[in-house]
């Protein structure tokens, strides 16, 4: 009875726009094969100089690696040749072709539908486990904000297909060991922990084994707890500026804050010849502050138009939130206009700004 419904013609497919570049080709080669990748010019037109890249690093031609503008050959392939290959335009670095190459112990047998994640029988007579993408397993420390999800993966192959188990801090790790449990996907060689908490910190080891051997990988998980702090201002902003009389100037201030920040731009002024009051607080005038329709983006920029000598001086970006305040300052130097500078030079005078 369920047969008819299983074979139902599926409704229209929902198109999900994906990333650039063009679709990645998944290719599987046997150990010892020659890997040949071809990348004809798009639209058949001229291609210009190209570069071949593997896992983000440019390929260096050798006796074994033959590089041409439209073709790449890797002779006598081994596991180490597995990876992501792309052909890029040398000048723009635009990816023209992208290939996912996997080299297995078996003679090549066509496409591999589901990429690196699926468990499979490689067709090798016998074989100890090995990582299918060892270059992806270099990173071992994962720092994650609390309440997010963590996935550890150890994709492997071997014959017979190996089993995978997980340890936490060297001990067997099971779902009942954490609130919220864990999700294991043996087909994807993965362990998932949803909504992590500080007690999830520790070392997680995958153990992949069959009767011919065992391999393991240990990852360290750190769960970050957020402590509220006063706004952080980007170093170097605002920057000191030198401007010509009558020109326009912009000061920038980049504010990072958990709590909603309140941003103000201040100009330091003198009162009765003094820059600070009796209590040591500087005299300032507020140039810009949050209004009904002012966005944070707008507040992060102070624009001065048609500057005069009176605009010279010290400017401060002040950011506060419920925790406290932070401020950075910068100086504006205003120089005379070009013709005044020329006259000054002829007179032998020097302007210090």
């Amino acid at each position: 009875e369920s047969l008819g419904t299983e074979q139902r013609v599926v409704g229209r497919a929902a198109e999900v726009p994906g990333p650039e570049p063009g679709q990645q080709e998944q290719l599987v080669f046997g150990s010892g094969d020659a890997v040949e990748l071809s990348c004809p010019p798009p639209g058949g037109g001229p291609m210009g100089p190209t570069v071949w890249v593997k896992d983000g690093t440019g390929l260096v031609p050798s006796e074994r690696v033959l590089v041409g503008p439209q073709r790449l050959q890797v002779l006598n392939a081994s596991h180490e040749d597995s990876g992501a290959y792309s052909c890029r335009q040398r000048l723009t670095q635009r990816v023209l072709c992208h290939f996912s190459v996997r080299v297995t112990d078996a003679p090549s047998s066509g496409d591999d539908e589901d990429g690196e994640d699926e468990a499979e029988d490689t067709g090798v007579d016998t074989g100890a486990p090995y990582w299918t993408r060892p270059e992806r397993m270099d990173k071992k420390l994962l720092a994650v904000p609390a309440a997010n999800t963590v996935r550890f993966r150890c994709p492997a192959a071997g014959n017979p297909t190996p089993s995978i188990s997980w340890l936490k801090n060297g001990r067997e790790f099971r779902g009942e060991h954490r609130i919220g449990g864990i999700k294991l996907r043996h087909q994807q060689w993965s362990l998932v922990m949803e909504s992590v908490v500080p007690s999830d910190r520790g070392n997680y080891t995958c153990v992949v084994e069959n009767k011919f051997g065992s391999i393991r990988q240990t990852y360290t998980l750190d769960v970050l707890e957020r402590s509220p702090h006063r706004p952080i201002l980007q170093a170097g902003l605002p920057a000191n500026q030198t401007a010509v009389l009558g020109s326009d100037v912009e000061f920038h201030c980049k504010v990072y804050s958990d709590a909603q920040p309140h941003i103000q731009w201040l100009k330091h002024v003198e009162v009765n010849g003094s820059k600070v009051g009796p209590d040591g607080t500087p005299y300032v005038t507020v140039l810009k502050t949050a209004g009904a329709n002012t966005t944070d983006k707008e507040l992060e920029v102070l624009s001065l138009h048609n500057v005069t000598f009176e605009d010279a001086g010290e400017y401060t970006c002040l950011a506060g939130n419920s925790i406290g305040f932070s401020h950075h300052s910068a100086w504006l130097v205003v120089l005379p206009a070009e013709e005044e500078l020329v006259e000054a030079d002829e007179a032998g005078s020097v302007y210090a700004g």
């Epitope: 990333p19 904000p145 963590v150 993966r153």
Partner: antibody, heavy 127, light 97 residues
Framework: EVQLVESGGGLVQPGGSLRLSCAAS????????ISWVRQAPGKGLEWVGR????????NYADSVKGRFTISADTSKNTAYLQMNSLRAEDTAVYYC????????????????????WGQGTLVTVSS | RSEASGDRVTITCRAS??????VAWYQQKPGKAPKLLIY???FLYSGVPSRFSGSGSGTDFTLTISSLQPEDFATYYC?????????FGQGTKVEIK
Amino acid sequence: EVQLVESGGGLVQPGGSLRLSCAASGFTFTSTGISWVRQAPGKGLEWVGRIYPTNGSTNYADSVKGRFTISADTSKNTAYLQMNSLRAEDTAVYYCARTYGIYDLYVDYTEYVMDYWGQGTLVTVSS
Amino acid sequence: RSEASGDRVTITCRASQDVSTAVAWYQQKPGKAPKLLIYSASFLYSGVPSRFSGSGSGTDFTLTISSLQPEDFATYYCQQSYTTPPTFGQGTKVEIK
């Protein structure tokens, strides 16, 4: 219990501004993100943007870049969507959704998932 | 598309380019907010009935409801989060036959 409540919707003229609020409760606001998603009448879902209050980082859809600004006040557990220069095509129900990351050393991207959604607030841009 | 209670329903989603397994599925009923069903192509979100399952990788993804229940009549959206901005499919409405 995780809850998100949007407010601030209403009728506004083209070129006008509106500020939507998303009050969150029941979870650690600073550890996860807040996304805004809209749905025009009778149409599908369109992602507008998201903020990670942890560091204030924001991303926006091209259709709203430069006009909309997302911010958050962690002391109030509230996210905001400031909408300026509104157009008729911005008419939609606006949803906020808690957004968490799936962190995976094996891949070179972080997958973001929207797991809890508010009830939505209707914004109508019309003269 | 019209379906009957008890049917096995398969909804497909095709990405224009490889999005690995970074695909989520949402269910939306009229006048209500979307609900997360599946993330990372095949992981059932907590509290979602086990009759829902997801599969796929690369460009082709499937949401399966093993035995359609009356409360499952809704619109289903897939969404990729491999790149920013994330994008949704146009939705598939499952109606009562």
